[in-house]
């Protein structure tokens, strides 16, 4: 059974992940981003189901494409270094989903824009955090 300290650690990691995803979304989904129109042409795979930590496997598998799109975004309003940012997210995702269980991600038929993709995983984090608090 999960202890209160492990639950607290999970909550903090989810809050960190949520913050990272929101910062990315804020950096790209705004009228000051010169590359937004181009970035919206890239397609991302969405999870068929995302209700448990193991489903973060679906996010992990899309981190490389996410980094490639973020490499376009360097501007006055986007100061984060995509490689470092994605690396940080990857570390958190690996810790949260656990590496001992292998989970095959199932994707939805419809692909999504980067904005829809980020919003989906932001909602996921918020939802799990709310069950922990």
């Amino acid at each position: 059974a999960p202890t209160s300290s492990s639950t607290k650690k999970t909550q903090l990691q989810l809050e960190h992940l949520l913050l990272d995803l929101q910062m990315i979304l804020n950096g790209i989904n705004n009228y000051k981003n010169p590359k937004l129109t181009r970035m919206l042409t890239f397609k991302f795979y969405m999870p068929k189901k995302a209700t448990e930590l193991k489903h973060l496997q679906c996010l992990e598998e899309e981190l490389k494409p996410l980094e490639e799109v973020l490499n376009l975004a360097q501007s006055k309003n986007f100061h984060l270094r995509p490689r470092d940012l994605i690396s940080n997210i990857n570390v958190i995702v690996l810790e949260l989903k656990g590496s001992e269980t292998t989970f095959m991600c199932e994707y939805a038929d419809e692909t999504a824009t980067i904005v829809e993709f980020l919003n989906r995983w932001i909602t996921f984090c918020q939802s799990i955090i709310s069950t922990l608090t």
Partner: antibody, heavy 122, light 111 residues
């Protein structure tokens, strides 16, 4: 002094078109992004559209996407809003506002016009 | 879209007394450039809005120092230290971190 003056408002029937203008003076118009923001009678503010300083990018609120077009003529220091397929819910005072996001201070929407009234009614 | 929620929606105040308006965003407003694009606008009856505060706490030029802004993350506050007659009207918070959205407005009137 820095000034924005909107014009082109009026009463129009649903489905018809209208073109709003915003004349800028007292500043280097071509250095600023420009927005249209509207306010329905007795309601709050709603962002409508934005255009980059050089006209290279434009974005719209979902409520007007595909019906409204924002444009600018930097040689004439003028901003435009072409409004097609007008609906009753487009009835509002339309304001233009400048935005200096490329400036050092980055004030945001720091100068607003007096507004022009658009009434969509049959 | 980021939803901005203001409280209270109406605030009757006494001249010379302080007033405070809160604004909450549905998600954090910190941008990847480190800035938080949260502004406060004031609109008098029959007038266009005018900028008071930008980036949480910076007073725009010509704005009296009785106005101050504070906050972080998702929670922001506009304070008027001593309300004057010319301060009546509607106050809006606005975010431009993503595409611009406004709070519903808070009507400040004299008791």
């Amino acid at each position: 002094q820095v000034q924005l003056v909107e014009s082109g408002g009026g009463v129009v029937q649903p489905g018809r078109s209208l073109r709003l203008s915003c004349a800028a003076s007292g500043f280097t118009f071509s250095s600023y992004g420009m927005h249209w923001v509207r306010q329905a009678p007795g309601k709050g503010l709603e962002w409508v559209a934005v255009i980059w300083y050089d006209g290279s990018n434009e974005y719209y609120a979902d409520s007007v996407k595909g019906r409204f077009t924002i444009s600018r003529d930097n040689s004439k220091n003028t901003l435009f809003l072409q409004m097609n397929s007008l609906r009753a819910e487009d009835t509002a005072v339309y304001y233009c506002a400048r935005d200096d996001w490329f400036g050092e201070a980055d004030y945001g929407m720091d100068v607003w016009g007096q507004g022009t009234t658009v009434t969509v009614s049959s | 879209d980021i939803v901005m929620t203001q409280t209270p929606l109406s605030s009757p105040v006494t001249l010379g007394q302080p007033a405070s308006i809160s604004c909450r965003s549905s998600q954090i407003l910190v941008n990847s450039d480190g800035n938080t694009y949260l502004s406060w606008l004031h609109q008098r009856p029959g007038q266009p809005p005018r900028l008071l505060i930008y980036k949480i706490s910076n007073r725009f030029s010509g704005v009296p120092d009785r106005f101050s802004g504070s906050g972080a993350g998702t929670d922001f506050t506009l304070k008027i230290s001593r309300v004057e007659a010319e301060d009546v009207g509607v106050y809006y918070c606005m975010q431009t971190t993503q595409f611009p959205t406004f709070g519903q407005g808070t009507k400040v009137e004299i008791k």
